[in-house]
Each structure stands twice: as structure tokens, then as C-alpha cells.
């Protein structure tokens, strides 16, 4: 039988990339467990991660039901074993998370250059359209299908022999750029949602250079 009182969770933080969404909190539990609830502003509280000793809970399954909704989570603390609870009048201790709107706030994952193809003095660069965990009619949607024209990609490209970078933008997943014949170029892309106020840009993709496996060259 213990005497350590139950404490409320704190530092509730949303960690979300391409809609994969995890709620994290502190402290590591001592003689207590947690249960998480999630709700939309107009919806009901749904419990997840029951009686867990983890300090994180994957809420992806709930938020992908409607990524444009605003969600709130709360973390309940319950005494483990025969430990006293500090809740007043038998009410359980809980702490609310900040609000979270996946469509506006999920981080954009690092993009990947799928391929590039040179035809004469033109190069077509294709960005991989990553699949998300957002479903529609039973199938998983890609990032482009979720964000549509809200999502743009910025291409950074430069001659292998120099450091001067050029940029191009597209609201599809393809770029068609002019290059100098006989020169090798390197490419990196970044996902951007210009309309956002936070988490507007992804990290840059890995650099891909002509003359390596991903490229194709045709006269």
C-alpha cells in the first residue's frame, strides 16, 4: 500500500508529421497510470491508450477521420495499486492539451525526389507523392490528395560544378526546368503550404544529382 499521491500530467504536446499524430506528456509515471481522451469541439470524448504507463498515445486513428476539425485531448491520471488519489470529491485528475488542427498544423514530412529525366535541355523532376494515413472510401490518400493546391513544392537546383542555386515552384508534383546541355545538375525539394502561419515548410529532401541512378537521359 503506497502513499505517493497521484499527479496530473503536464507538458501535453502534439507531435504530428504527415498526419501521423502522437500526443506526448510528462511525467514518467510513479504509482500511477494514464488514460487519454480525444474530442472535437462539437464531438464526444473518446478514450484511447487505456491504463497505460507510457507517456505518449498514438491518436492518428481518431484525427484522420476529419483532418480539418480542431481536436482537444486530455490525459487522466489514475492511482496504480492501492495508492491514494488527489482528485477532489472523487473526481479524476486530468490535464487538457492545446487545441490541434491537423490540416493546419501537422508537420510536412521530408519529401523525396522520385525521379528526374533529361530530354535535351529540359529536365523533368518528379516528387514522390507520399501516402498518408488519411482514408477516403477505404483507401489511403496521398499528401497531394489531402492538401490539393494548398501544397506546393519548391525545387532547388544547381550545376554540380558551381554553388549558385536556382529555384522553381509547382503546385503539382512535377517540375520542368531548363538546363544547360552537357552540364550535370543537383536537385533538392521542399514541401510548402504558403497559406499556413505555422509549420509552413518541410525540411529539404536528400540531394539527388544527375549521373546517379535516379536519373534518365535522352537526346
Amino acid at each position: 500500500s503506497g502513499t505517493t499521491n497521484t499527479v496530473a500530467a503536464y507538458n501535453l504536446t502534439w507531435k504530428s508529421t504527415n498526419f501521423k499524430t502522437i500526443l506526448e506528456w510528462e511525467p514518467k509515471p510513479v504509482n500511477q497510470v494514464y488514460t487519454v481522451q480525444i474530442s472535437t469541439k462539437s464531438g464526444d470524448w473518446k478514450s484511447k491508450c487505456f491504463y497505460t504507463t507510457d507517456t505518449e498515445c498514438d491518436l492518428t486513428d481518431e484525427i484522420v477521420k476529419d483532418v480539418k476539425q480542431t481536436y482537444l485531448a486530455r490525459v487522466f491520471s489514475y492511482p496504480a495499486g492501492n495508492v491514494e488519489s488527489t482528485g477532489s470529491a472523487g473526481e479524476p485528475l486530468y490535464e487538457n492539451s492545446p487545441e490541434f488542427t491537423p490540416y493546419l498544423e501537422t508537420n510536412l514530412g521530408q519529401p523525396t525526389i522520385q525521379s528526374f529525366e533529361q530530354v535535351g535541355t529540359k529536365v523533368n523532376v518528379t516528387v514522390e507523392d507520399e501516402r498518408t494515413l488519411v482514408r477516403k472510401n477505404g483507401t489511403f490518400l496521398t499528401l497531394r490528395q489531402v492538401f490539393g493546391k494548398d501544397l506546393i513544392y519548391t525545387l532547388y537546383y544547381w550545376k554540380s560544378s558551381s554553388s549558385g542555386k536556382k529555384t522553381a515552384k509547382t503546385n503539382t508534383n512535377e517540375f520542368l526546368i531548363d538546363v544547360d546541355k552537357g552540364e550535370n545538375y543537383c536537385f533538392s525539394v521542399q514541401a510548402v503550404i504558403p497559406s499556413r502561419t505555422v509549420n509552413r515548410k518541410s525540411t529539404d529532401s536528400p540531394v539527388e544529382c544527375m549521373g546517379q541512378e535516379k536519373g534518365e537521359f535522352r537526346e
Epitope: 464526444d44 470524448w45 473518446k46 478514450s47 487505456f50 491504463y51 504507463t53 496504480a80 495499486g81 479524476p92
Partner: antibody, heavy 121, light 107 residues
Framework: QVQLVQSGAEVKKPGASVKVSCKAS????????MHWVRQAPGQGLEWMGI????????VYAQKFQGRVTMTRDTSTSTVYMELSSLRSEDTAVYYC??????????????WGQGTMVTVSS | DIQMTQSPSSLSASVGDRVTITCQAS??????LNWYQQKPGKAPKLLIY???NLETGVPSRFSGSRSGTDFTFTISSLQPEDIATYYC?????????FGGGTKVEIK
Amino acid sequence: QVQLVQSGAEVKKPGASVKVSCKASGYTFANYYMHWVRQAPGQGLEWMGIINPSGGITVYAQKFQGRVTMTRDTSTSTVYMELSSLRSEDTAVYYCARGGSKVAALAFDIWGQGTMVTVSS
Amino acid sequence: DIQMTQSPSSLSASVGDRVTITCQASQDISNSLNWYQQKPGKAPKLLIYDASNLETGVPSRFSGSRSGTDFTFTISSLQPEDIATYYCQQYNFHPLTFGGGTKVEIK
């Protein structure tokens, strides 16, 4: 097949303690929570608490806090429920029930056969 | 604690009848509700989980639905082997709680 086998009936005096066992077989013991539920004669079902067999963490209904202790022995895939300071109103059938799979969160999909505990002076 | 008010407490119906049992939660429990069948002298058996999902191996004449805090359990065509007591159980809030039960008998 998946089953939970409980220990036999007990008769106890008021103030005594009883310890009921529940042996699991046919599945990975550590992967599912175990619950204890009791049923007084002619009455409904009452949840007592839960034990996570992988770490031994327990959570009890407040009504039983301080009187109940749930433990487990991973080497024999057995969980135990001990209830102390027995009184006549603790006379009931005590069930262990498996729960906590990812599909059916806290639904009790497998039950023990029940252990009748009679508290009488 | 969340109160689960189950009604009726007992009912008598004929073989082939449609039987409906309701369970009302004292506050919002989302779809975190299960239904069990308990035959005399036996342990309960899970029939429906998460308000409307049929447990594997359970006959399709059993079904469940939700409307807000009201939950309905239906036997579409009562069979003699369905004589039992039926319980709802919520798990959205600690502690987990059961309804008082509905005893189903054959006329």
C-alpha cells in the same frame, strides 16, 4: 484453445482474506490485460480492477481500494486476486476476464468459469 | 462513476420475435460500450463491442447501435437458446461500469 481456469470455491469467515487464482493458456499472457469482475447472488456484474500482466501494474475501482490486491506470475501465466477484511456482502462469484486487445479495447472476450466465495460466520 | 441504466429489467417474448434492450449512459461515453450474454450458472459471453461490432462467432441476429448516450441491443429473431440475462458495459471512463441487466424469457 484460449481459456482461463480459476481456483475452486472458498468459504471464509468475516475479517479473513481470500486469494483466487486464474491460469491463462492458449495465448500470449503478457499481451492482454486481465480484469476481475464479481457477481453477488442474483445481482449484476461489478468491475473490481485490472492488471497488466507484462508489467504487473494494477488499477482498482475505488470501492475496493485498500482491500484488493491483484498480482501475476508470468512463469505460470497466472493472475491472482486477493480480497481482505471480508464481510458478508463480499459473498459472490468472482470472475477473471481477459480484455484489452487492440480491436476490442476494454471488452472482456474470454472469461474464467468463476469462483464462488462465501463469507459466513 | 458513470451510471448505466438498462431497461427493461426483464421481458418475455415469443420465439421469432424481435427483442430490443436499451442502455442509457449518465454522460457521453462515445461508442465505448459492450454487450454481454449470461446464461444461468455460466460466465458472461461477449456479443457486441464498441456499440455495434459483432464479436467473432456470434450469430448475426444480434446487433447493437448508438444514438448519443442511448444504446440499443437487438435480437432480430428470438431463439430458444437466447434465454439469458444481457448486460451492457461502458469503458470510456474509470471505473468500468455495467448496466443492471435484462432477463430475457420465452413466452
